[in-house]
Amino acid sequence: IVLRPSRVHNSEENTMRALTLKDILNGTFSYKTFFPNWISGQEYLHQSADNNIVLYNIETGQSYTILSNRTMKSVNASNYGLSPDRQFVYLESDYSKLWRYSYTATYYIYDLSNGEFVRGNELPRPIQYLCWSPVGSKLAYVYQNNIYLKQRPGDPPFQITFNGRENKIFNGIPDWVYEEEMLATKYALWWSPNGKFLAYAEFNDTDIPVIAYSYYGDEQYPRTINIPYPKAGAKNPVVRIFIIDTTYPAYVGPQEVPVPAMIASSDYYFSWLTWVTDERVCLQWLKRVQNVSVLSICDFREDWQTWDCPKTQEHIEESRTGWAGGFFVSTPVFSYDAISYYKIFSDKDGYKHIHYIKDTVENAIQITSGKWEAINIFRVTQDSLFYSSNEFEEYPGRRNIYRISIGSYPPSKKCVTCHLRKERCQYYTASFSDYAKYYALVCYGPGIPISTLHDGRTDQEIKILEENKELENALKNIQLPKEEIKKLEVDEITLWYKMILPPQFDRSKKYPLLIQVYGGPCSQSVRSVFAVNWISYLASKEGMVIALVDGRGTAFQGDKLLYAVYRKLGVYEVEDQITAVRKFIEMGFIDEKRIAIWGWSYGGYVSSLALASGTGLFKCGIAVAPVSSWEYYASVYTERFMGLPTKDDNLEHYKNSTVMARAEYFRNVDYLLIHGTADDNVHFQNSAQIAKALVNAQVDFQAMWYSDQNHGLSGLSTNHLYTHMTHFLKQCFSLSD
């Protein structure tokens, strides 16, 4: 159980106050984290509160400003990047968001040696992506879907690609589906370790069907947004990977990297690229039916000026029980011999663990094991491997950092974080300097987040980087809800849940229950993290009990739970939410006439299906930007879990799992349907179809759209959204305003 320390004593009760919705909307109780921008083994950059860019040297204890806030302000810079030779800084301004990760910006290059901006051969605008080479100060950037290279910031650019075309050919940046569902980055180019080569992806979207929606704006006529967006079963982007020698790029030109034969025989994806050395690169490919992944190690052949990917350096990863990997196929972390690597994949018991691959996957040496999962490999050095897992005390929603000594035999394992601040910190991530000389730990909770700096050899804490003192003080007079994380055992399934309880919770009383659900494949909602958010307010001020349940399909508890939903989305996720609700009712403190469910995106889909389950458990519910049919969602995501919507594959379940098919069942619940009209991700089409089905079934419901808003419903829409949902729930639960 994780109980937030209650500071409510009778003597101070009148000084304590509940959270308000305004607190949440204003971000009054938001926390800060500190991630050093490492530039060497012992130095990092950080943007100070007054916007100076400061270089810190851990070993000397000295710090100095490398770029003043005055310089930043002169071009309205919101971001920066120091060249590895420390001669130049790029300053980023005019940030303009595109999709989840992508944005365009204007870039200025500042010469630190003379304290002036580089004049002549300035960068064009707006640029889609820009980065320094890992050594020196070469620049690669993407402008109008083409890649350019500068040997020095003041030099003229060399154009590497010429076929870039808006919505047709993307060079060095992903198209919509690769950005959102495969790479999870705004870039698709990768420098080799010493900057000799530049690898990049070309995405050809010429044949992809286009999603078109109106953007209303302020003009007389709305404009139409067109995005090549492959929905399930549709034509996919065609990807090619090229590598160019950046020393003499005009000579040989871009060289295409061959696709493994077993991948190229049918539709496929490129999933990631990892440089090993300047002349060795590792590419990962995935069949369109995403249960086979191939990792291919390619070598530069100087005599041929080509990249050779021998079959002996192809490593196949296949899943027989689900899809390959977790959410994504994991990426390799290479060891110092530049051929063997460490990688997370399922062991024979169906738990994701670290394996060491020296020659073949079949001969992989398992490094971690147990009925828990290794989650991320942070760093491999000559003698240590740092990783995170949820092993400690068998809580899947925790993250601790471990070190395995790989330099000694047998390897020994040490938990770096388990006992540091045990009550406060149970969910960590880490950021390592070069050679893991030092590292920062960022603790996300369950207590107030704290970021600390550590010695990479001894693990000794050097200093606190950010401890959120202001937040701690601000919360002193706030009646925060209590939180507990527990599990239910039902029919051989373990359902972990987090319950958020009103500050003066009394087990003998009855409380309205709100289920918050996401439930998407390989997601996790029950995590030991700190948050003061909308549901905190609902518990603190409105006296609701809120529960989050991780059912089948969720992550980090083994393949049995994860792959249970394979090819049948919308079944077990819903069943498990319902099962949990029944268990909560049995606990005795839930008013079974006042139970609601809400979710966003995949959670909107699950909440809609739960409301339409015909159980009579839910009085009301909210779906924000829900998927309503898997035929409407992106191919890469959907087909990973559902296969293809074809008769000879899985069309039947595609049809059976729609929200529309259950329209009749909404008759006895209060349903609030919410969607942004400019949602590029889960298209408004999804909610339009739900609404149409409900109207056709003559079922009453409530709805709210947000004009020109995307999947995030940001800005003023956020305030309106949470205010609107609060009213809806209070009305549903008969709570006075």
Partner: antibody, heavy 117, light 108 residues
């Protein structure tokens, strides 16, 4: 030893077509981008077209775009230039050269194309 | 496109003399993308100076390239009889690659 040998030149009428070939040897042909460069009688050098090693990407000078097509057959180690709608100003010695945008480190001996009525 | 202007058009020198050939670009090129070629009558051009002012394979060290930005120079330290030919500079930083109009080095 790298060798490039052009063929296919000759006399052709305006509006006519011609296909030039360049047989390559002495290097891994499929690894290198290749170009065509021409030289009108008594004049300087003019780059005409280039093609990537795999043949997947092609590039043309504005003066020939839409009329000339560069291609390659890596199994035969041969580079081609299909020239259609020929004009008098296309009269030149056509060289095949190893390289993309430069430098061009090896050149063939050239083949003369004369466009005249 | 980038225009390369070579000067002089013709250079009349005697064997043993130093030849200095100039190539000026209409916009910045940098030496990373500039090459020099030699062409003798009835022959194909031959690469002399590779990008980055490096001599191509088999080119004698009397040939050297220099310059940056928009101004480049090919220097032949001591002219040999076989050096009398036409010399071209070429840029490869921008499509289309372009050549200078050539400088003819003739025997005085």
């Amino acid at each position: 030893e790298v060798q490039l040998l052009e063929s296919g030149g000759g006399l052709v009428q305006p509006g006519g077509s011609l296909r030039l070939s360049c047989a390559a040897s002495g290097f891994t042909f499929s690894s290198y981008a290749m170009s065509w460069v021409r030289q009108a009688p008594g004049k300087g050098l003019e780059w005409v077209s280039a093609i990537s090693g795999s043949g997947g990407s092609t590039y043309y000078a504005d003066s020939v775009k839409g009329r000339f097509t560069i291609s390659r057959d890596n199994s035969k180690n041969t580079l081609y230039l299909q020239m259609n709608s020929l004009r008098a100003e296309d009269t030149a010695v056509y060289y095949c050269a190893k390289g993309w945008l430069g430098p061009f480190d090896y050149w063939g001996q050239g083949t003369l194309v004369t466009v005249s009525s | 496109e980038i225009v390369l202007t070579q000067s002089p058009g013709t250079l009349s020198l005697s064997p043993g003399e130093r030849a200095t050939l100039s190539c000026r670009a209409s916009q910045s090129v940098t030496s990373s993308y500039l090459a020099w070629y030699q062409q003798k009558p009835g022959q194909a051009p031959r690469l002399l100076i590779n990008v980055g002012s490096r001599r191509a394979t088999g080119i004698p060290d009397r040939f050297s390239g220099s310059g940056s930005g928009t101004d480049f120079t090919l220097t032949i330290s001591r002219l040999e009889p076989e050096d009398f030919a036409v010399y071209y500079c070429q840029q490869g930083i921008m499509l289309p690659p372009t050549f200078g109009q050539g400088t003819k080095v003739e025997i005085k």
